[in-house]
Interface confidence: low
């Protein structure tokens, strides 16, 4: 249960809109405000992952709950609507050509979400314009059911992506992550997020910003210079929502990204990251798909240290202990091996600088008929403070251009039982990833070379 | 540090209106609930309703709905209850209070006290 | 609207004694319980809140204990300037209600 929160959401459209949606740019949001108050949430926080098959850790190794299982469950809870932010949607194996047993986990969920339309809740999809899946049919086949699709064009906008991932069911309950809405999400790729139950208020401050998108994804949408005052948050770095998830005295704020998309009152995604940085005393624990202290997808390229700048200070001037675990797979680009390397030549033990990089490889194995999958798609970050859970890749276009959101949570720990923080929790996740045989350290690695399994 | 500030006490006739005040200092206005409690002299406390500054949100108590308006001004940090109609019934010490962490009331002002009289 | 009965309306004790008030819900209220203390000249203070939380600057001799619908609040050492009224509340569900109240006086 928590605290109540600012109130505000309630006033995203008209209060006379009704649920099945009007025809304007908002979508309608239910339950109200004043019915949210009448009852106590009591909010639960679980961490959920995607373990890709043939991924065995070592036997006694803790794990999150599984993704895939954590949104059907998700989609079992949904009595009104559900709205999906996801850079691109492929729940079916046929959208990529390829014909595998993983893929019916994807397939089942689309299954599922073409049941709950059948039912009358409501699913209101934002998406990307430009896209990745561009073959796909699972957003035909939902909106032939009634689902509402809107695609939000931020290469015109922001010449970014929509890079978001992250659900809102009933205006209670959450799922953010790396994950994509696609079945290699669920079953080829390794991913990280949380679910959070019962948490209206913290629901409703998520869902302002799937109302950013949604308004933005109208025809000849423009950026505005200021967004409405509906859109503005109460809930940020400066005032996090307070409250209890399962009787632990928590604090929580969404973060967002780019700061074109950030009402006001909406931490940034940047500042939100720096923040968890800069409060770190004793470590910080970074696993992140991507690493580029530059710009990538923008040209000329360029250099933008800015997060690099904030390990290497913590790391050099409070002796805070960086660990990086950077994705390695058959995609990724080698030009970032210099910088990891870069960054682990600040490491000093005399000096008491201490700096490590590994590299994640999942082992391809018998999977190699699907592509863009066997890797590590995670996007956290944990430190003794708090927990950071991510949908952007460490580079600076998904900070300036691309929208992505961000999660903070921080426990009180001692008030239950040792090892049940979020922030323990994760930490756990992270040194069970980082002490895996998967992880190897950047001597192994020489530059340039494929991130293939040498088992 | 957090204070609420009360005027001490109103007369007023029966039938008409009274609006009384709660000035805030000490901390975000903007950011906390507003509660409004009455105690009837020698009784208990009664929740008439709450307000949140931030964006004009409020709660009523069943009861009050007709007698009570909440009402703020954030740029003076300063919360206004409204009693309209009054009748002896209404003459009570009606209290302000912020609502902190997990709604519990965690400041108090002093109390308004009103007398309904002719 | 959920009921909170106090049924001790007034209390004698000696000062050092250790005092407990009690307060039922009329159905569960899940922790959400605060207890406030009004002195003589009508000065309300938090005391406790979510059942066993103790407010900031208050004393270590009030705690608060229960759960479900039945809770009680504690003063272990009783001293000449807790001699005031205590009010439980319910913040479990709208609308907020209080206990009748429990006044406390010196034996």
């Known amino acids: 249960w928590q605290v109540r929160c600012p109130p505000t959401w309630g006033q995203v459209q008209p209060r006379d809109v009704p649920r099945s949606w009007g025809h304007g740019s908002s979508l309608a949001l239910e339950p109200l405000e004043a019915e949210v108050r009448k009852q106590r949430d009591s909010c639960q926080l679980v961490l959920v992952e995607s373990i890709p098959q043939d991924l065995p850790f070592a036997a006694g190794s803790l794990s999150a709950q599984p993704l895939g299982q954590a949104w059907l469950q998700l989609l079992d809870t949904a009595q009104e609507s559900v709205h999906v932010a996801s850079y691109y949607w492929s729940l079916t194996g046929p959208d990529i050509g390829v014909n595998d047993s993983s893929s019916q986990l994807g397939e089942a969920l689309l299954q599922k979400l073409q049941q709950l339309l059948g039912r009358n809740i409501s699913l209101a999809v934002a998406t990307s314009s430009p896209t990745l899946a561009r073959k796909s049919t699972d957003l035909q086949v939902l909106a032939a059911r009634g689902a509402q699709v809107r695609r939000v064009p931020m290469g015109r906008l922001t010449r970014g992506v929509l890079h978001s991932k992250f659900w809102v069911v009933d205006g209670r309950h959450i799922y953010m992550g790396s994950a994509n809405m696609d079945w290699r999400s669920l079953t080829q790729v390794k991913e990280l997020g949380a679910v959070i139950y019962n948490c209206s208020h913290l629901a409703q401050d998520l869902e302002k910003t799937f109302q950013t998108y949604w308004v933005l994804g109208v025809p000849k949408a423009v950026l505005p210079k200021t967004w409405p005052q509906n859109f503005s948050s109460h809930i940020n770095r400066f005032q996090p929502f307070q409250g209890l998830f399962d009787g632990v005295p928590t604090t929580a704020y969404f973060s967002a990204s780019p700061p074109a998309l950030c009402p006001q009152g909406r931490t940034p995604d940047l500042e939100a990251l720096l923040a968890v940085m800069g409060s770190a005393q004793e470590f910080i624990y970074a696993s992140v798909m991507e690493y580029f202290p530059t710009t990538r997808f923008s040209h000329p390229r360029r250099y933008w240290p800015v997060l690099d700048n904030a390990l290497r200070a913590a790391a050099f001037s409070k002796g805070v202990r960086v660990r990086l675990l950077v994705s390695c797979g058959l995609n990724t680009d080698p030009t970032m091996f210099p910088y990891l390397r870069s960054l682990q030549a600040l490491s000093n033990p005399a000096a008491n600088v201490s700096v490590d990089v590994k590299v994640f490889i999942v082992p391809v194995g018998n999977h190699s008929n699907i592509p863009f999958s066997r890797v590590n798609h995670s996007k956290f970050m944990v430190t003794e403070k708090a927990a950071y859970i991510g949908t952007s890749n460490w580079s600076e276009d998904y900070f300036s251009s691309t929208t992505g959101v961000g999660l903070v949570v921080t426990q009180s720990p001692g008030a239950q039982p040792a090892g049940a923080t979020v922030q323990e929790q994760l930490r756990q996740l992270f040194e069970r990833d980082w002490s895996s045989r998967y992880a190897v350290g950047l001597d192994g690695q020489a530059p340039g070379q494929d991130c293939v399994w040498q088992g | 540090q957090v204070q609420l500030q009360q005027p001490g006490a109103e007369l007023v006739k029966p039938g008409t209106s009274v609006k009384m005040s709660c000035k805030a200092s000490?901390?975000?206005?903007?950011?906390?609930?507003m509660h409004w409690v009455k105690q009837r002299p020698g009784q208990g406390l009664e929740w008439i309703g709450d307000?949140?500054?931030?964006?004009?949100?409020?709660n009523y108590n069943e009861k009050f709905k007709s007698k009570a308006t909440l009402t703020v001004d954030t740029s003076s940090s300063t919360a206004y209850m409204q009693l309209s109609s009054l009748t002896s019934e209404d003459s009570a010490v009606y209290y302000c209070?912020?609502?902190?962490?997990?709604?519990?009331?965690?400041?108090w002002g002093q109390g308004t006290s009103v007398t309904v009289s002719s | 609207d959920i009921q909170m009965t106090q049924t001790t309306s007034s209390l004698s004790a000696s000062l050092g004694d250790r005092v407990t008030i009690s307060c039922r819900a009329s159905?569960?209220?899940?922790?959400?319980l605060n207890w406030y203390q009004q002195k003589p000249d009508g000065t309300v203070k938090l005391l406790i809140y979510?059942?066993?939380r103790l407010h900031s600057g208050v004393p270590s001799r009030f705690s608060g204990s229960g759960s479900g619908t039945d809770y009680s609040l504690t003063i272990s050492n009783l001293e000449q300037e807790d001699i005031a009224t205590y009010f439980c509340?319910?913040?479990?569900?709208?609308?907020?209600?209080f206990g009748g109240g429990t006044k406390l006086e010196i034996k």
């Open positions: 209070a912020r609502g902190g962490w997990l709604d519990a009331m965690d400041y």
């Open positions: 000490g901390y975000t206005f903007t950011s906390y609930w």
């Open positions: 307000i949140y500054p931030g964006s004009d949100s409020t």
């Open positions: 159905q569960d209220i899940s922790n959400y």
């Open positions: 979510y059942t066993s």
């Open positions: 509340q319910q913040g479990n569900t709208l609308p907020w209600t």
